[in-house]
């Protein structure tokens, strides 16, 4: 429908303005511009958005007006290229403006920065925020969209509208409350944490599409939707996969207006056809649009249909396996993936994709053999080790998590990953290992049947963060290899890495281990990050240090911080005791 609908409009910009409404149109254009030009001041973006909006209104009034027939990429690209400081601020990105569409848009996309050099967002006092909210609600909410979009250039735009709606609701409610802070701060913390998770999940979808292609994304979508909607027929799942792929291709490609419009259409279709999709959609479908789309995306798995037959009948025992495969390879593999996934909500999507890949490889080999059936008869036996590997890994790591707690579990992962890939920057190792460590509290509480999909699919999201950050400044061939060889085998690839024996230990620098009284005023989280940064640096200096040695040094360090933060003259304590700690640590580690 989307493709035909587009052809029917003389003016694409007018069409999207009418479909989305002025408020959403302006918000989405702001997000698009902020995701492309991440360093531009807020006011500059607002000015550009207002100009585009005024132009769109002229096209709504008369679709034949000058320039109204231009593509959105042409209109938006022309607008971005009017920015006066483009060369000074963005350097070679300015060269994009010399190109024609579609190359110009591709050029802008390639310059999106996953780790832009922007100051950390500091949360003002609650009263200050409430005053700003009341003074100019529209500007306050636009600023939110702008700040999130520029820091997360792949954030799923229609979902960011949903976050902004919740952000507004939090301020509307809490700025009238008796205890504003008690009401607002937990809500803002929740939005921040959910926002980071949402951004990371979407970043994996975009990486999947951009680095591994549409087929890889569609395979992921078949597996996930089949788990979620096991009662839906293959044809229905295939239709949803096609539509969902279009939505995410658009958003990942910067086509945010089309993406939001098509996402709304998809939610509408799902709700109109929920009888043939899932029994779990009723509540979602009663909500307003943004909430509805979010709810559908997060909806729990439906119950499996009764009496599903053995998979072997269709995919191993049938005399027509090679005939069916040869007739339409991807369709037959899609059927296999659908049938396997709907029976296994207890498997991670990446495991299901590994099984499908194994099945495909077997058919490729066996259907060319003298006796195909004899050759592929035992294919399901090859699945056993693939299933057991993540099961065992999750069991071991959940036991370790339960034994250590989150902070110390993160530290164990910090040591493990620093030894695997010591060339990676310390901030990246800390960020990624902390996130890997969160898998414990997120997933280990679940029963066995829910642990693997929770844990392994979450790890895929976190390892993708490592991959995109590393791609910006590649320093490790091992990281590049694990990130690029196979999307579904990234986690097993990283798990299989041993200590990097080729690594030359970092020179010892006392400054790295010098701490000051300001550590005492940091939040618990910030203090943990400081200690974890020191731990990574220790391992980079002494990669062969044992767990026991590192634990002893870290315990001494924790005691040192605690002691000096209680001292009357904190700064003197940090200076004097710090020297002693560095000397003792060097001795303990044989530095």
């Amino acid at each position: 429908r989307g493709v035909f609908r587009r052809d029917a409009h003389k003016s694409e910009v007018a069409h999207r303005f009418k479909d989305l409404g002025e408020e959403n149109f302006k918000a989405l254009v702001l997000i698009a511009f902020a995701q492309y030009l991440q360093q531009c001041p807020f006011e500059d973006h607002v000015k550009l958005v207002n100009e585009v909006t005024e132009f769109a209104k002229t096209c709504v009034a008369d679709e034949s007006a000058e320039n109204c027939d231009k593509s959105l990429h042409t209109l938006f690209g022309d607008k971005l290229c009017t920015v006066a400081t483009l060369r000074e601020t963005y350097g070679e990105m300015a060269d994009c403006c010399a190109k024609q569409e579609p190359e110009r848009n591709e050029c802008f996309l390639q310059h999106k920065d996953d780790n832009p050099n922007l100051p950390r967002l500091v949360r003002p006092e609650v009263d200050v925020m409430c005053t700003a909210f009341h003074d100019n609600e529209e500007t306050f909410l636009k600023k939110y969209l702008y700040e999130i979009a520029r820091r997360h250039p792949y954030f799923y735009a229609p979902e960011l509208l949903f976050f902004a709606k919740r952000y507004k609701a939090a301020f509307t409610e809490c700025c009238q409350a008796a205890d504003k802070a008690a009401c607002l701060l937990p809500k803002l913390d929740e939005l921040r944490d959910e926002g980071k998770a949402s951004s990371a999940k979407q970043r994996l979808k975009c990486a999947s599409l951009q680095k591994f292609g549409e087929r890889a994304f569609k395979a992921w979508a078949v597996a996930r939707l089949s788990q979620r909607f096991p009662k839906a027929e293959f044809a229905e799942v295939s239709k949803l996969v096609t539509d969902l792929t279009k939505v995410h291709t658009e958003c990942c490609h910067g086509d945010l207006l089309e993406c939001a419009d098509d996402r709304a259409d998809l939610a509408k279709y799902i709700c109109e056809n929920q009888d043939s999709i899932s029994s779990k959609l009723k509540e979602c479908c009663e909500k307003p649009l943004l909430e509805k789309s979010h709810c559908i995306a997060e909806v729990e798995n439906d119950e499996m249909p009764a009496d599903l037959p053995s998979l072997a009948a269709d995919f191993v025992e049938s005399k027509d396996v090679c005939k069916n495969y040869a007739e339409a390879k991807d369709v037959f593999l899609g059927m296999f993936l659908y049938e396997y996934a709907r029976r296994h909500p207890d498997y991670s999507v990446v495991l299901l994709l590994r099984l499908a890949k194994t099945y495909e490889t077997t058919l490729e080999k066996c259907c060319a053999a003298a006796d195909p059936h004899e050759c592929y008869a035992k294919v399901f036996d090859e699945f056993k080790p693939l299933v057991e590997e993540p099961q065992n890994l999750i069991k071991q790591n959940c036991e370790l998590f339960e034994q250590l707690g989150e902070y110390k579990f993160q530290n164990a992962l910090l040591v493990r990953y620093t030894k695997k890939v010591p060339q990676v920057s310390t901030p990246t190792l800390v960020e990624v290992s902390r996130n890997l460590g969160k898998v414990g509290s997120k997933c280990c509480k679940h029963p066995e049947a829910k642990r693997m999909p929770c844990a392994e699919d979450y790890l895929s999201v976190v390892l993708n963060q490592l991959c995109v950050l590393h791609e910006k400044t590649p320093v490790s061939d091992r990281v590049t290899k694990c990130c690029t060889e196979s999307l579904v085998n990234r986690r097993p690839c990283f798990s299989a890495l041993e200590v990097d024996e080729t690594y030359v230990p970092k020179e010892f620098n006392a400054e790295t281990f010098t701490f000051h009284a300001d550590i005492c005023t940091l939040s618990e989280k910030e203090r943990q990050i400081k200690k974890q940064t020191a731990l990574v640096e220790l391992v980079k200096h002494k990669p062969k240090a044992t767990k026991e040695q590192l634990k002893a040094v870290m315990d001494d360090f924790a005691a040192f911080v605690e002691k000096c933060c209680k001292a009357d003259d904190k700064e003197t304590c940090f200076a004097e005791e710090g020297k002693k700690l560095v000397a003792a640590s060097q001795a303990a580690l044989g530095l």
Epitope: E233, F234, S276, L308, P309, S310, D314, V331
Partner: nanobody
Framework: EVQLQESGGGLVEPGGSLRLSCVAS????????MSWVRQAPGKGLEWVSS????????SYADSVKGRFTMSRDNAKNTLYLQLNSLKSEDTAMYYC???????????LGQGTLVTVSS
């Protein structure tokens, strides 16, 4: 437009056999599991059997297990139900429907009547 055209019903004595057919059009037949349901005079719809998309996997109601056999020919967009050892309680209007073990109402064709009587 989805169309399902059943045929092959008739009058048969107890212990006898029939082969029902259902020709599908208006959708990609091989992308759907298919089922047979029946409705005895004055009764509600009863699920009879289902078959997977590829045709290797089947499931049957206890009341027909061992007597009925379901199959499909994807090249001909046709579904079959072989009815053996028929009993008077098998008398019903038989319909083919899209989907596995349908537990939600689905549009029915005109059906084919099976009457088992001596």
């Amino acid at each position: 437009e989805v169309q399902l055209q059943e045929s092959g019903g008739g009058l048969v004595e107890p212990g006898g056999s029939l082969r029902l057919s259902c020709v599908a059009s208006g959708f990609t037949f091989q992308h759907y599991a298919m089922s047979w349901v029946r409705q005895a005079p004055g009764k509600g719809l009863e699920w009879v059997s289902s078959i997977s998309m590829v045709g290797g996997g089947t499931s049957y109601a206890d009341s027909v297990k061992g007597r009925f056999t379901m199959s499909r020919d994807n090249a001909k967009n046709t579904l079959y139900l072989q009815l053996n050892s028929l009993k008077s309680e098998d008398t019903a209007m038989y319909y083919c429907v899209r989907g596995w073990h349908p537990d939600v109402p689905r549009p029915l064709g005109q059906g084919t009547l099976v009457t088992v009587s001596s």
